[in-house]
Amino acid sequence: EEELQVIQPDKSVLVAAGETATLRCTATSLIPVGPIQWFRGAGPGRELIYNQKEGHFPRVTTVSDLTKRNNMDFSIRIGNITPADAGTYYCVKFRKGSPDDVEFKSGAGTELSVRAKPSAPVVSGPAARATPQHTVSFTCESHGFSPRDITLKWFKNGNELSDFQTNVDPVGESVSYSIHSTAKVVLTREDVHSQVICEVAHVTLQGDPLRGTANLSETIRVPPTLEVTQQPVRAENQVNVTCQVRKFYPQRLQLTWLENGNVSRTETASTVTENKDGTYNWMSWLLVNVSAHRDDVKLTCQVEHDGQPAVSKSHDLKVSAHPKEQGSNTAAENTGSNERNIY
């Protein structure tokens, strides 16, 4: 009678993560008597995957009933496959021996490859905000995919970026891989509503790439422009001075009025108006009673935006240009929440 052969008909099997892998094996004879075992890998470090008679293998089921007297089908199914299951699986026939069973013949092996989807890309920007014309870096990470081949692209508002560097790790063979990419983006004043998108394409995604996004509103700081103007005379001894704070982002802003270098009032931007580009405008005003002043007044609008060093704009108010009420040194009453009189 011909010597027993162990046949593994599939040289390779490709399975998606989470699915069940079927590893086929048949023997050509019932002799010698002894069990079949499945191993991953060869040599002394091989891992036992299934032993017909002993051990706990909750993920493995047999395709046929191994207890049937004439059974020669030793195929197995392994459930809930993960990338860690990738490798070459050997169906090995043992013959009964004493004290231990002795390896008799091995199949040629079946290579199990696992396709695993990449995790959703996570995009992160710089820790601190930056101003227009500056270049900032964004990183994109995705993990757990297999095989190694993967494509990553960067977009800003739908326009593909070219200034980026990408690494896939590890370089050698692994059960699964990770991708890390860093893109450089030049900020503009219009970027409050902009998005940076990292797009990952992989064979497991069937042409439907995964995307991770970052809003540049989290990254950009648009500093304000200031304009101090003197409004027409409201009454013969009153002047309305306004400070226009324009095109700033984010909203966090504190304004201080100084009169001849002395703090007059400090307020925080509240009822701002939003521009189409996402930046904000705000206006503060002072009602100045010029009759309270003998000399010219230097009014300064000082703005601290988003914790940055203060910027300021000044306006010289000519007291001599306005007639004074004789004997009066009383300022006009406050007439609005944003109004303040200078004494």
Partner: antibody, heavy 114, light 108 residues
């Protein structure tokens, strides 16, 4: 569900024999080995031997080789362990254990005393 | 035969503490064949970890196993009062199958 139900406690004299039974249900009896493990009071676990119910092939711990016999009756899905020439140090709880090492019998206390 | 030596014999720790139990084999054991059991008084042993590092069904993930060759470890990351028991390692790599002498874990 899988169950291994063992026979009741036994008290034996030194030199006598004891036969403990283990009735299996809830799985294909011939699928896996059936082991016997014992535990003396306050002591560790000691593997005595195993049987393959499919063909009655046995393996024994050399320590018990001459005194232990493990058998099966596949018609009743029952495994047996017989220990002869009992001595006081054989006083222990005897467990039958399915080959997957997950399913254990409830244990049978054997007391050897003169 | 392969002799499995467990240490320490007794471990007395407080709830929330980390327990590290050692099992040393007299000759190399393939990690696929190294199992751990938990046994409480009056009960049969219960399979805790199989193939060195895999948690058996229903076992909380505070239990973990590691090792290779001759040195194996069972770790309980944060002890709970119900973890008070005796823990045994076991090899079925070669005949005769053997068990370690056990480590008793006491909760203070």
């Amino acid at each position: 569900q899988v169950q291994l139900v063992q026979s009741g406690a036994e008290v034996k004299k030194p030199g006598a024999s004891v036969k403990v039974s283990c009735k299996a249900s809830g799985f294909n009896f011939e699928d896996t080995y059936m082991h016997w493990v014992r535990q003396a009071p306050g002591q560790g676990l000691e593997w005595m031997g195993r049987i393959d119910p499919a063909d009655a092939d046995t393996k024994y711990n050399p320590k018990f080789q001459d005194r232990v016999t493990i058998t099966v009756d596949t018609s009743t899905n029952t495994a047996y362990m017989e220990l002869s020439s009992l001595r006081s140090e054989d006083t222990a709880v005897y467990y039958c254990v399915r080959g997957n090492y997950v399913n254990w019998g409830q244990g049978t206390t054997v007391t050897v005393s003169s | 035969e392969i002799v499995l030596t467990q240490s320490p014999g007794t471990l007395s720790l407080s709830p929330g503490e980390r327990a590290t139990l050692s099992c040393r084999a007299s000759s190399s054991v393939s990690s696929s064949y190294l199992y751990w059991y938990q046994q409480k008084p009056g009960q049969a042993p219960r399979l805790l970890i199989y193939s060195t590092s895999n948690l058996a069904s229903g076992i909380p993930d505070r239990f973990s196993g590691s090792g290779s060759g001759t040195d194996y470890t069972l770790t309980i990351s944060r002890l709970e009062p119900e973890d008070a028991a005796v823990y045994f390692c076991h090899q079925w790599y070669s005949y005769p199958r053997t068990f370690g002498g056990g480590t008793k874990v006491e909760i203070k």
